[in-house]
Amino acid sequence: DVERTTCPPEKEVHEIDESLIFYKKRELEACVDAALLAAQMDRVDAIPFTYEQLDVLKHKLDELYPQGYPESVIRHLGHLFLKMSPEDIRKWNVTSLETLKALLKVSKGHEMSAQVATLIDRVVVGRGQLDKDTADTLTAFCPGCLCSLSPERLSSVPPSIIGAVRPQDLDTCGPRQLDVLYPKARLAFQNMSGSEYFVKIRPFLGGAPTEDLKALSQQNVSMDLATFMKLRREAVLPLSVAEVQKLLGPHVEGLKVEEQHSPVRDWILKQRQDDLDTLGLGLQGGIPNGYLILDLSVREALSHHHHHH
């Protein structure tokens, strides 16, 4: 329970103004009414409160809104947003992109990734889906924030907005997120010509299945090594040496640099050594001629054993 003090008559607060910066923590607790604070939230960010004072104001709002703040208050949080935890934000219902923009601006330069991810999640829930306006707001005010959404939330993205997504917006996306986004991108770009299609689909290829990689290998796309290294391990393993050579084109030489890293290392273990030799890159670790090892896990164990001895 909160320790209660009485507000001195001369400190009574009738409106939220700059005089409050001179109030001690206890005086703010006793004298600032949460309902008045909420009503005049638009004034708070213009007042240079200390972090300790902001803590008191946050507790006041928590007292007034135990089920989560309404958007009329969230919109005007300003620097008070820096005091919010993901658990606080999870209680919110946000539909306005103006609110989202305001809070994204405030969070810039602060370690707020968990809070921002939760905020974006609440906006997507509030708006029913990740629509074009929301995506545009994210790309403008928070590049990379798209990847903070869960795969479940990303599943609500209509293919029509995929075109607005820039490669750098996907830099922090994990495999599960790309699994969701890739089919949407494929649909969005399906009417484009080969080279144009590849440029557009490339950032999403971390979600591509083997069949699509095989198809791309037939189109002289010359995939760069950085993109290849982001492909799903399971999608790369079934590709033949010839298919990988066609897929990478002149970039195939980069396999030598990456031969100890996944997915290249895992792919090498699956290939016949004589097929690898045709590349002329000196890649080692393929299945020796005349051998057929079906269990890759046994092979990986053997491979590790050879590396250590």
């Epitope: 004298c31 009414d33 309902a35 009503a39 006041k60 007292e63 135990p66």
Partner: antibody, heavy 119, light 108 residues
């Protein structure tokens, strides 16, 4: 079902004291702002005071400041109004009301208790 | 303090007619903190409208609120017999919280 039941009203002489109670049920009292509003006979509504749930921050109308004290006992789900130095102009029906912070309005009211200040 | 002035003081109308009640604030208040109440003789007030335009739970859609800044309006599109009562506006944007003096809607 939300219920607010006021008690403690009655006839009191000028300068006397009275304590009103409001028993609340049907909602989470410990989370809720509460208010007292009064209505003099044949007149309009006048806000008297309110109190916050956790910090018990209080506010009063100028007409009662220094004479009335609002308080609450969260363990008993009860709101109080201690009225001292009563005047004839304090004669009114006193309503206890729940302030809905999400709406900015008083969404549930008791039926009121009459306080008459007269010699 | 914010003074809320309601007009007219009394409105004489017949059932089925439209009622328009006005509430003017002495200075601008946020519409999120403007409410309307209905009170019938011998009864406690009842919240009708909050946030200037949102109907409270169980309030029929013939009641609507509008306005911003200093001018707010409560409209009853078609008066029903049970709507004849006193109506108050109230602001909780500034302390002290204040009510208007009320508008009585009576049967013509």
């Amino acid at each position: 079902e939300v219920q607010l039941l006021e008690s403690g009203g009655g006839l009191v002489q000028p300068g006397g004291s009275l304590r009103l109670s409001c028993a609340a049920s049907g909602f989470t009292f410990t989370n809720t702002y509460m208010s007292w509003v009064r209505q003099a006979p044949g007149k309009g509504l006048e806000w008297v005071s309110n109190i916050s749930p956790t910090y018990s921050t209080t506010n009063y109308a100028d007409s009662v400041k220094g004479r009335f004290t609002i308080s609450r006992d969260n363990s008993k789900n009860t709101l109080y109004l201690q009225m001292n130095s009563l005047r004839a102009e304090d004669t009114a029906v006193y309503y206890c009301a729940r302030y809905n912070s999400y709406q900015g309005g008083l969404d549930y009211w008791g039926q009121g208790t009459l306080v008459t200040v007269s010699s | 303090e914010i003074v809320l002035t309601q007009s007219p003081g009394t409105l004489s109308l017949s059932p089925g007619e439209r009622a328009t009640l006005s509430c003017r604030a002495s200075q601008s208040v946020s519409s999120s903190y403007l409410a309307w109440y209905q009170q019938k003789p011998g009864q406690a007030p009842r919240l009708l409208i909050y946030g200037a335009s949102s109907r409270a739970t169980g309030i029929p859609d013939r009641f609507s609120g509008s306005g911003s800044g200093t001018d707010f309006t409560l409209t009853i599109s078609r008066l029903e017999p049970e709507d004849f009562a006193v109506y108050y506006c109230q602001q909780s944007y500034y302390y002290p919280i204040t009510f208007g003096q009320g508008t009585k809607v009576e049967i013509k």
